[in-house]
């Protein structure tokens, strides 16, 4: 029997019947087997065929075999209802090999030409199945010259056979108090040969509870449990299943906080599966009732382990834990069936009792001593000494637990004090210095430090006084001695005032004429205003009606007297203002330098002289009497004047206080 | 020198009055404020109150502003301290003390040597 | 009222000895006086305005501070020196005085 080619010669040739294209002869018989490599296959067909005809080909025919597989037996030149001639077919063998044979009887009726083939290996594509054939590969399928291969989607792995896909599916572990869980694919079809392990771990104190929800379809066996996929529940207590068949099995309650379910999968069936629905309990806490003016939230029928409840107080009430104030309050139910904090209180805010209001008072108006939520108190200045500043002095306690005005301000109210208050009436005319009585001048205010000056208080802790009185101690404001409240300079009975600054105008020059003489003295406290102290008021832009040429104005202070001591005791005159061109004149003569007299100075004094202010009078205030608001205010500030006070044809000069208005509110607001 | 020179040891009966005087030396009288201090037995100092001898301006603490009564005689430069209603308590030695001028005002530069005042019944 | 606190209340001492005696006011003071006063005797003026010594005061005696810590310091102590010392301010009224220092010999 001739053998075809063997792989791995190239596997391709003709076949032909013997004495082909001649007739062939009687009792004819032929062999062929052919091999083609492994993962491949032989392909035939023919290009000429002329056999005998007989029934079912009993005479002369070519038949093709494929290991113990009848392909096709064949004769005549076309087919019939009973008989097959290859016509164009083409002819594959089912394997790598291919057996043909030829036959021929002892008898032809006619010649008959025989036939002749062609065949060649090709590659089997092992992907392509029949239909109702079982796939080749469970996922995926690839094909390649000689072989092929198969692969899984991603949670699954190849099993060691090569073509069924296990799943991944060991591991997972369940945390919530709740969940889902199925076995792989649900609800379609499980994967075969796979071992999945899942865990429910739930914290100490919890107790998980199993449903089988939707559907159960695990294959089974009637007679015997489980043989082949199989579904088991284990606990720490007690193992459940195993689980297979069409039937949800029932709700199992573990008792347990830790769960393993284990789902076995052999080699061979179709089946959708299992899904499980899990939940969990734990001994309930008591049932948390809010307290008075509070919430509880969220509210629940019941509460477990790990549940929480927060509590809000309504407006106007804040947490408190005992005596201590909470933000916030949230509590914790614990594996014991108790609450991890006790239940706090909801209290009405208490804005505790006001703050001082320095030189003012507070008066309960809701009730005496009541600082709880609404609450209203009314702020007021001392009487006669201060007023309050931009505020009606009305405050509740609101909810943040703080006083709070009626413009929403969180902040005192301000008293301010009153200036310009003299228990002295002028009487106009003009006489001799004097003694001041108790509140004549309670804004002046003795300066020493080296010498001896003054000044005047403006608003509780600024003084204003001559820049030449305080130029020293400019660069070292703490040695400046301020006192007031006094009428008598060496009574030790005075109120002591220190500074923290020294501000003297940038205009001012020292020993170099008195143009802008004037300073400010910030003092580091308020200090407190009564018929003793109080300020001078500043002039208002209408003030320069009632400084007008021979208007009166008042010098006060402890310098120099006729007798050429310092005074004693606090002394004052009464002096008519100077016209300005009056008084130029007067110093234009030597010894002093022209120009001495500026438009920032004012003059004030009797052209016959005598009354006068003089040496350590320098800083203090030369006030007047504003008519409209009958309040005092500066004028002009002690300067400088004829070497002898008090000469005729001589003035006192005064700095002009309304030229530097905006200054000294500068200077003020800034610092 | 300056002196302050003080009226002899008193024994007084509780609800009597004492009046003791203190002779100013040695400076102007009147230019100077005269302060009355006291020291009750191992105690320290107490401030009664103060008077200006030019003008017999006077002031007292709380304390003594009901018994306490300070005056001058300044054509004999002495000041004198009256208390009344005297109880066991107000046994002490009574200073009088000048008030220094040169700067402060508000210390003692001169004191008296103490007036022993006893009050027992 | 200011309160003001010395301390210690009393000490003993060695002739030669430095010796520093604190006086702690309530409330801040600007100026601080100190007296010393011997068995049966008047206080006498040691220090004024917190730091300058008073007339005819041995200049081993000196004092500091501010605010509300004043000390008096004998640099080098003298059998004289044995006495009670008082702190005085008048920043704010009424005047007060301290409780007294009892400088003893050892």
């Known amino acids: 029997t001739p053998l075809g080619p063997k792989w791995p010669e190239p596997v391709f040739g003709r076949l032909a019947s013997p004495g082909f294209p001649g007739e062939y002869a009687n009792d004819q018989e032929r062999r062929w087997t052919l091999t083609a490599p492994p993962g491949y296959r032989l392909r035939l067909y023919f290009t000429h065929f002329d056999l005998e005809l007989s029934h079912l080909c009993e005479y002369d025919f070519v038949k093709l075999s494929s290991g113990a597989k009848v392909l096709a037996t064949l004769c005549g030149q076309e087919s019939t209802d009973t008989e097959r001639a290859p016509g164009k077919d083409t002819f594959y063998s089912l394997g790598s090999s291919l057996d043909i044979t030829f036959r021929s009887d002892y008898s032809n009726e006619k010649p008959f030409t025989g036939f002749e083939a062609f065949y060649a290996a090709e590659d089997i594509d092992e992907c392509q199945v029949a239909p109702g054939e079982a796939p080749t590969c469970d996922h995926h399928c690839h094909n390649h010259l000689g072989g092929f291969y198969c692969s899984c989607r991603a949670g699954y792995v190849l099993h060691r056979n090569k073509r069924t896909c296990s799943a991944l599916c060991s591991g997972q572990v369940f945390t919530q108090r709740s969940g889902e869980l199925s076995s792989p694919e649900y609800p379609r079809p499980y994967p075969k040969l796979s071992s999945c392990t899942y865990s429910i771990s739930l914290e100490e104190g919890f107790s998980v509870i199993l449903d089988f929800v939707e559907s159960f379809d695990v294959e089974t066996h009637p007679e015997t449990l489980c043989p082949y996929d199989f579904l088991k529940i284990q606990t720490d207590r007690e193992e459940h299943g195993p689980f297979c068949g069409k039937t949800l099995p029932h709700r199992i309650e573990t008792k347990s906080n830790t769960v393993t379910i284990t789902f076995v999968t052999d080699e061979s069936g179709d089946h959708t599966g299992w899904k499980i629905h899990y939940t969990s309990t734990a001994q309930p806490c008591p049932y948390p009732m809010a307290p008075p003016n509070g919430h509880v939230s969220p509210v629940q029928a019941k509460y477990i382990l790990k549940d929480s409840f927060s509590i809000f107080c309504e407006t106007g009430y804040e947490l408190l834990q005992g005596h201590l104030p909470l933000k916030s309050f949230t509590a914790v139910c614990q594996k014991d069936g108790s609450w991890d904090r006790p239940m706090p209180a909801c209290s009405i805010v208490d804005c505790g009792p006001p703050d001082d209001l320095p030189s003012g008072r507070v008066e309960y108006i809701t009730g005496p001593g009541v600082t709880t939520y609404k609450a209203v108190i009314q702020y007021s200045c001392e009487e006669t000494f201060y007023t309050m500043k931009v505020n009606d002095g009305k405050y509740v306690c609101e909810a943040d637990g703080f006083w709070t005005s009626s413009k929403g301000e969180k902040s005192l109210p301000v008293c301010e004090p009153v200036c310009g208050l003299s228990a002295r009436t002028t009487g106009g005319r003009i006489y001799g210095g004097q003694k001041a009585k108790p509140g004549d001048f309670p804004w002046q205010v003795l300066i020493l430090g080296g010498t001896t000056a003054a000044g005047a208080l403006l608003y509780d802790n600024w003084v204003l006084t001559a820049a030449h009185a305080v130029y020293e101690q400019k660069h070292d404001a703490s040695a400046l001695d301020i006192r007031m409240g006094t009428l008598k300079r060496l009574s030790p009975h005075y109120t002591q005032a220190w500074s923290e600054a020294v501000f003297i105008h940038e205009g001012y020059t020292h020993d170099a004429g008195f143009d802008n003489d004037i300073a400010l003295i910030k003092l580091n406290n308020k200090v407190v205003i009564n018929s003793n102290i109080t300020p001078i008021c500043l002039p208002r832009k209408e003030a320069e009606s009632f400084m007008r040429t021979d208007d009166i104005g008042t010098a006060s202070g402890w310098g120099l007297t006729q007798r050429g001591f310092l005074a004693r005791n606090l002394m004052y005159v009464d002096i008519p203002i100077v016209d300005h061109q009056k008084c130029t004149a007067a110093y234009e003569k030597p010894p002093y330098p022209r120009g001495s007299v500026t438009a920032n100075m004012l003059c004030a004094g009797l052209e016959s002289g005598g009354k006068d202010s003089c040496r350590g009078d320098s800083g203090g205030a030369l006030v007047f009497l504003d008519s409209e608001t009958e309040r005092w205010f500066v004028g002009g500030i002690v300067s400088w004047g004829s070497m002898n006070c008090g000469e005729a044809g001589q003035y006192g000069v005064y700095t002009k206080v309304i030229n530097y208005i905006p200054w000294i509110e500068n200077i003020i607001s800034d610092f | 020198q300056v002196q302050l020179v003080q009226s002899g040891a008193e024994v007084k009966k509780p609800g009597a009055s004492v009046k003791v005087s203190c002779k100013a030396s040695g400076y102007t009288f009147t230019n100077y404020w005269m302060h009355w201090l006291r020291q009750a037995p191992g105690q320290g100092l107490e401030w009664i109150g103060d008077i200006d001898a030019s003008d017999s301006e006077t002031h007292y603490i709380e304390k003594f502003k009901d018994r306490a009564t300070l005056t001058i005689d300044k054509s004999s430069s002495t000041a004198y301290m009256e208390l009344s209603s005297l109880r066991s308590e107000d046994t002490a030695v009574y200073y009088c003390?000048?008030?220094?001028?040169?700067?402060?005002?508000?210390?003692?530069?001169?004191w008296g040597q103490g007036t022993l005042v006893t009050v027992s019944s | 009222d200011i309160q003001l606190t010395q301390s210690p209340s009393s000490l003993s001492a060695s002739v030669g000895d430095r010796v520093t005696i604190t006086c702690s006011a309530s409330s801040s003071v600007r100026y601080m006086y100190w007296y010393q006063q011997k068995p049966g005797k008047a206080p006498k003026l040691l220090i004024y305005?917190?730091?300058n010594l008073a007339s005819g005061v041995p200049s081993r005696f000196s004092g500091s501070g501010s605010g509300t810590d004043n000390t008096l310091t004998i640099s080098s102590l003298q059998p004289e020196d044995f006495a009670t010392y008082y702190c005085q301010q008048w920043s704010s009224y009424p005047l007060t005085f301290g409780q007294g220092t009892k400088v003893e010999i050892k």
């Open positions: 305005d917190t730091s």
């Open positions: 003390a000048r008030g220094d001028i040169t700067t402060t005002l508000r210390y003692f530069d001169v």
